[in-house]
């Protein structure tokens, strides 16, 4: 069966949108009006993972691009990256662990916890125009809460 996917955009809890910053990086900034068209559209795939009653495993690809958010160690630190994949083989139901995020819904907000690195979350900075990154703290300065907007296929 083809993996179930939906198209969506994400905004952090301060309403910053996510846009491409170079070929392999995302950044978060406030967009308005026609600039909203710059925000990345994700293809969120529902995949196998350590699913629980509170966590749904997903993979986050960039729509119509062979790029997926993935979590790897760089200089001994969990790091978020955009990784290029073979479009013939992705998305798939059984994604490698580095591509999997646990989608957690709390009070109408979403968190995306790395399956590879528990308690590390997709994060944005308070500051404008900064890279989206993998952060190891919740409830601090950095933002780990997002809202999701559905996009028609």
């Amino acid at each position: 069966a083809p993996v179930r996917s939906l198209n969506c955009t994400l905004r952090d809890s301060q309403q910053k949108s996510l846009v491409m910053s170079g070929p392999y990086e995302l950044k978060a900034l406030h967009l308005q009006g026609q600039d909203m068209e710059q925000q990345v559209v994700f293809s969120m795939s529902f995949v196998q993972g350590e699913e629980s009653n509170d966590k749904i495993p997903v993979a986050l690809g960039l729509k119509e691009k062979n790029l997926y958010l993935s979590c790897v160690l760089k200089d001994d630190k969990p790091t978020l990256q955009l990784e290029s994949v073979d479009p013939k083989n992705y998305p798939k139901k059984k994604m490698e662990k580095r591509f999997v995020f646990n989608k957690i819904e709390i009070n109408n907000k979403l968190e995306f916890e790395s399956a590879q690195f528990p308690n590390w979350y997709i994060s944005t900075s308070q500051a404008e125009n900064m890279p989206v990154f993998l952060g190891g703290t919740k409830g601090g300065q950095d933002i780990t809460d997002f809202t999701m907007q559905f996009v028609s296929s």
């Epitope: 069966a1 350590e50 966590k55």
Partner: antibody
Framework: EVQLQESGPGLVKPSETLSLTCTVS????????VSWIRQPPGKGLEWIGL???????YYNSPLKSRLTISKDNSKSQVSLKLSSVTAADTAVYYC????????????????WGQGTLVTVSS | DIQMTQSPSSLSASVGDRVTITCQAS??????LNWYQQKPGKAPKLLIS???TLPPGVPSRFSGSGSGTDFTFTISSLQPEDFATYYC?????????FGQGTKLEIK
């Protein structure tokens, strides 16, 4: 060698809480999930739920409101608690190890304990 | 939840016979289908995973095939120790669900 062993009281009174322990060896509970499955006498198998290596749980809907699965990694033990039991909860209860092979086979249960019969009766 | 329909519910056969059991899923589960053998008073034992893969130590007379919704489990030549109850299990998504079981008896 992977081994799982269930233990607990064989008789529980209606409305009380059924408590079982699964003691494992040959693998670490931090690395592998453990499921609970039950089988009423002469009937088929029903998957109850599981606890993952990181401690997250998934409970099957029909039992969700009455079920708690927890673990103690240092003791290599997983526990199951089922509250407000009735005669319908009489069954052999099994624990089983998840295969946990990411990108290949996460959800298959590859090793099982021998099971323990729990009878709910006054 | 995914429903697993297993048939037949019981089966009589003789040593040396070829035996086939089928399992049908209510939705497409790719190849995430396992087969277990259970003898009276014993725990289920994994015989086949991912529709057709035999774990180490499982005799080659056991085989499985299928994908999507329709799956088959075959014992090519029944041995005396094969008389038991067999269950399919879908491991595609939670909650995991079993077939009703097939009791294989001596004719």
């Amino acid at each position: 060698e992977v081994q799982l062993q269930e233990s607990g009281p064989g008789l529980v009174k209606p409305s009380e809480t059924l408590s079982l322990t699964c003691t494992v060896s040959g693998f670490s509970l931090t690395d592998y999930g453990v499921s609970w499955i039950r089988q009423p006498p002469g009937k088929g198998l029903e998957w109850i739920g599981l606890i993952w290596g990181g401690g997250d749980t998934y409970y099957n809907s029909p039992l969700k409101s009455r079920l708690t699965i927890s673990k103690d990694n240092s003791k290599s033990q997983v526990s199951l608690k089922l509250s407000s039991v009735t005669a319908a909860d009489t069954a052999v209860y099994y624990c089983a190890k998840q295969r946990n092979l990411w990108g290949y086979d996460l959800y298959t249960m590859d090793y099982w304990g021998q099971g323990t019969l729990v009878t709910v009766s006054s | 939840d995914i429903q697993m329909t297993q048939s037949p519910s019981s089966l009589s056969a003789s040593v040396g016979d070829r035996v086939t059991i089928t399992c049908q899923a209510s939705t497409d589960i790719d190849e995430d289908l396992n087969w277990y053998q259970q003898k009276p008073g014993k725990a289920p034992k994994l015989l086949i995973s991912l529709a057709s893969t035999l774990p180490p130590g499982v005799p080659s007379r056991f085989s499985g095939s299928g994908s999507g919704t329709d799956f088959t489990f075959t014992i090519s030549s029944l041995q005396p120790e094969d008389f038991a109850t067999y269950y399919c299990l879908q491991s595609d998504r939670f909650p995991l669900t079993f077939g009703q079981g097939t009791k294989l008896e001596i004719k």
